[in-house]
């Protein structure tokens, strides 16, 4: 198992509907034609497995099935997508990154992405 | 388990072409992306051509304009077609299956272009 960096963005806010996106960047050292993904979730010193995903380079990322994950890939670049996000989930977010083919075998975790999300405020009732 | 069953391989002449076919059976997800590489005799396995369930394409350099990969969703297959083919193209086929769990290998054909 070889090292490798992983780059990943320090803050990121969720939309009002529960999005969170973020770009997973890691530094190649060889040509990869498989690639796997995995978002993990840090929060009181637990670490959840939130999504994981593969894909053949220039194509797009296969997740499991009903996964809140989507994702793209762009060369080295991976763009995830985190849906249905709530205050609760909010925590650190980091991306890991494992070259699978052809070997060697390469791995590189991020620092993580801090993943804020605020549960909208319900609409006062009007008297219209 | 996933078990992949290729067929289609064989030897034909240069600016010939050849289909190569595998069907994906076993525990299947819903998505997953489906592929041929090839192995000449002495070098690594390469890439030739990959499908998702979607229909997102990718070709290697060499083979761009003269092959095309396809799928039957509904079958759980994948075509090659291969045409205008060099010698260059001779090697063994191996279909690939790549989901976000499982990963699996055909067996191989062997495609062999004569001058």
């Known amino acids: 198992c070889k090292a490798m960096h992983v780059a990943q963005p320090a803050v990121v806010l969720a939309s009002s509907r529960g999005i969170a996106s973020f770009v997973c960047e890691y530094a190649s050292p060889g040509k990869a034609t498989e690639v796997r993904v995995t978002v993990l979730r840090q929060a009181d010193s637990q670490v959840t497995e939130v999504c994981a995903a593969t894909y053949m380079m220039g194509n797009e990322l296969t997740f499991l099935d009903d996964s809140i994950c989507t994702g793209t890939s762009s060369g080295n670049q991976v763009n995830l997508t985190i849906q249905g996000l709530r205050a609760m989930d909010t925590g650190l977010y980091i991306c890991k990154v494992e070259l699978m083919y052809p070997p060697p075998y390469y791995l590189g975790i991020g620092n993580g992405t801090q993943i804020y999300v605020i549960d909208p405020e319900p609409c006062p009732d009007s008297d219209f | 388990q996933v078990q992949l069953v290729e067929s289609g391989g064989g030897l034909v002449q240069a600016g010939g072409s050849l289909r190569l076919s595998c069907a994906a059976s076993?525990?299947?997800?819903?998505?997953?992306?489906m592929g041929w590489y090839r192995q000449a005799p002495g070098k690594q396995r390469d890439l030739v051509a990959s499908i998702t369930t979607s229909g997102s394409t990718n070709y290697a350099d060499s083979v761009k304009g003269r092959f095309t990969i396809s799928r039957d969703n509904a079958k759980n297959t994948v075509i090659l077609q291969m045409n205008s083919l060099v010698p260059e193209d001779t090697a063994v086929y191996y279909c690939r299956f790549l989901s976000a769990s499982t990963a699996a290998w055909g067996q191989g054909t062997q495609v062999t272009i004569s001058t």
């Open positions: 076993g525990r299947l997800s819903r998505t997953f992306t």
